[in-house]
């Protein structure tokens, strides 16, 4: 009996036309939502003038439906048993699942000012930028609508820069009508234990953002894993959002709509400093902000963002060192709300429920030659927003899953 089930599973999780896995893989049957909470700055003047702690108040959720588009350019390669594809991006605002509209205003860090002062360290260039910042009446903080902040706006300061720079700024700009990839993953035909594991991303086996093993593209994209998942396994996956591979470990057994699943979580160790977790040494890319690689819980992904000083963390700086959150008032991290988990059906390796949580932060540093940053006495890793991307298997799919997979085994 067990062998027959194993055989059936192995057949059905292969990523090729005609299998259950392939149908759900090309276009997810699960509704995926991305909720945003924006950190509204309450005291912009005090911060700019006196280098006070930044007081933030989160506002949200603002919800978008995402991942509703089918994979594109799906191409099988029989020779190396891989399938390549593009994952198109799309986001549709869901007013009924949101606290307000896309036109809601927020006081946030001026993304262009913070980035330009970081990218151009030369004092003379900073003075030129300062004159343009003043001319455009820009400041350290700005008021932007949700739509502008997420999807892009024409920045008045950058519009004056004589250099050919992109004048449109947004945390997720460009997003709609773009695609992530090309991904090339193993289809599992020759070896089911490799199914969905990424072979190459954008034509490469490495990212070119990190040194050593940190630069590797490991595991799957977390939508599924090779079948017959064990609790003892460390599940590796790659997330283009955070420009790195990461891992999850088993936490508990969960019953999801009558289906037994394993809850895997991202452990705090994955965010630890190299002092505590030596494997993380290659995620420490500079010595000053990281306080000689002793800070933890924030990841400098500037190399992946054209030099813009973007730092990724967990929401509310969960699992981050006290020095990171010390200059920010109004944060309340808690594991239940702010950690990332994957609920995996162990026989098939399918992720039936997940909550991916991350926070986007921007570094802003004092600058002697940029007036609006001149009074700062310290560096700030400023939280801009945090997001919760969730998906849960639908009732109909769950019934089908119970009858065809778990029911047969039990």
């Amino acid at each position: 009996g067990d062998l027959l089930i194993q055989k059936t599973i192995k057949k059905q999780v292969v990523l090729e036309e005609g299998t259950i896995a392939f149908k759900n893989w090309v276009k997810t049957g699960t509704e995926v939502y991305r909720q945003f909470w924006i950190f509204d700055v309450q005291n912009p003047q005090e911060v700019m003038m006196n280098s006070s702690n930044i007081q933030v108040k989160q506002r949200g959720p603002y919800t978008y439906r995402v991942r509703f588009l089918a994979k594109e350019n799906v191409t099988q390669d029989a020779e190396d048993n891989t399938v390549s594809f593009l994952q198109p991006n799309g986001a549709i605002f869901e007013p009924s699942l949101s606290v307000g509209t896309e036109a809601d205003n927020f006081t946030v860090l001026n993304l262009a000012v913070a980035a330009a002062s970081h990218i151009y360290q030369n004092q003379f260039v900073q003075m030129i930028l300062n004159s343009l910042i003043n001319k455009s009446k820009s400041s350290m903080f700005q008021v932007r609508t949700l739509r502008e902040l997420l999807w892009g706006y024409r920045d008045p300061f950058l519009s004056l820069v004589p250099y050919p720079v992109t004048t449109t700024v947004g945390l997720f700009y460009p997003y709609n009508n773009t695609a992530d990839g090309v991904y090339k993953v193993f289809n599992g035909k020759d070896n089911i234990s490799k199914v969905a594991i990424i072979d190459t991303y954008k034509g490469k086996r490495n990212l070119s953002y990190w040194e050593s093993h940190c630069d590797m593209i490991n595991g799957t994209d977390a939508a599924s894993f090779p079948p017959f998942v064990e609790k003892s396994q460390v599940l590796q996956f790659f997330s283009s959002d955070i420009c790195r591979s990461i891992y999850a470990v088993f936490e508990s057994d969960v019953n999801l709509k009558g289906i037994p699943v394993y809850r895997f979580v991202l452990p705090s160790k994955a965010f630890a400093s190299p002092v505590e977790n030596p494997d993380n040494y290659c995620f420490c890319t500079e010595k000053i902000i990281s306080k000689n690689c002793t800070s933890y819980g924030v990841l400098d992904i500037s190399k992946c963002k054209e030099g813009r000083p973007v730092y990724i963390s967990l929401p509310h700086f969960l699992y981050a060192s006290p020095d990171v959150s010390e200059p920010i008032d109004g944060l309340n991290p808690n594991e239940e709300e702010h950690r990332t988990y994957l609920d995996i059906e162990p026989i098939t390796g399918f992720t039936l429920q997940f909550a991916k949580r991350l926070q986007v932060n921007l570094l802003v540093k004092p600058s002697e030659k940029i007036q609006v940053l001149k009074n700062l006495k310290r560096n700030y890793i400023v939280p801009i927003l945090w997001l919760n991307e969730t998906g849960t298997i639908g009732d109909e799919k769950a019934n089908m899953f119970r009858s065809q997979v778990t029911g047969k085994i039990n």
Epitope: V125, I128, N130, K369
Partner: antibody, heavy 123, light 107 residues
Framework: EVQLVESGGGLVQPGESLKLSCESN????????MSWVRKTPEKRLELVAA????????YYPDTMERRFIISRDNTKKTLYLQMSSLRSEDTALYYC????????????????WGQGTLVTVSA | ETTVTQSPASLSMAIGEKVTIRCITS??????MNWYQQKPGEPPKLLIS???TLRPGVPSRFSSTGYGTDFVFSIENMLSEDVADYYC?????????FGSGTKLEIK
């Protein structure tokens, strides 16, 4: 020792154009921000234009009204100032100046100067 | 634009005397003031840069103080070779602006 040699000055009529050059003997020329500064007959020093090391960023005071264009050719280790629609008030000794000392890049503005080239605008 | 007011316009001092020149700026420029010496027929020479920093090779009789909007340049014991025009320059913001100059002569 850093040497900056200006050339191209002379007597021109109002409305005419002139191109000044400043040649450097320095291997490190492409690493330095540069400026043109002029000294008027009234002995006033004025910034005319400035350019960053790779030529990507230029700066002109509003008073210069964009009649002047600063540029550089790092392969030739030369700085230029294209002057057009010249007026009598542009009469001055034009200096090119290099920012920064070798060991101390920041905060040493106009650290080295050329001898200057005289521009006279007169009918 | 930050305007720089330099005084006096000219100064006649005896050898060995202390010389002081003052520059006042229209905006707060922290300590971003520089001082230049220009002798006849020569280009200006940077003596003191931002932060009241004496440049290498410049004699220690030259000094400056000041922060914000008020700056003073001093020559402790004037020598005959110090006869020149002296200019201050604010480098806090663009456009860099010079003082109108002080002509130092021997009494």
């Amino acid at each position: 020792e850093v040497q900056l040699v200006e050339s191209g000055g002379g007597l021109v009529q109002p409305g005419e154009s002139l191109k000044l050059s400043c040649e450097s003997n320095e291997y490190e020329f492409p690493s330095h921000d540069m400026s043109w500064v002029r000294k008027t007959p009234e002995k006033r020093l004025e910034l005319v234009a400035a350019i960053n090391s790779d030529g990507g960023y230029t700066y002109y005071p509003d008073t210069m009204e964009r009649r002047f264009i600063i540029s550089r050719d790092n392969t030739k280790k030369t700085l230029y100032l294209q002057m057009s629609s010249l007026r009598s008030e542009d009469t001055a000794l034009y200096y090119c100046a290099r920012h920064g000392y070798d060991y101390d890049e920041e905060g040493a503005w106009f650290a080295y100067w050329g001898q200057g080239t005289l521009v006279t605008v007169s009918a | 634009e930050t305007t720089v007011t330099q005084s006096p316009a000219s100064l006649s001092m005896a050898i060995g005397e202390k010389v002081t020149i003052r520059c006042i700026t229209s905006t707060d420029i922290d300590d971003d003031m520089n001082w230049y010496q220009q002798k006849p027929g020569e280009p200006p020479k940077l003596l003191i840069s931002e932060g009241n920093t004496l440049r290498p090779g410049v004699p220690s009789r030259f000094s400056s103080t000041g922060y914000g909007t008020d700056f003073v340049f001093s020559i402790e014991n004037m020598l005959s070779e110090d006869v020149a025009d002296y200019y201050c320059l604010q480098s806090d913001n663009l456009p860099f602006t010079f003082g109108s100059g002080t002509k130092l002569e021997i009494k």
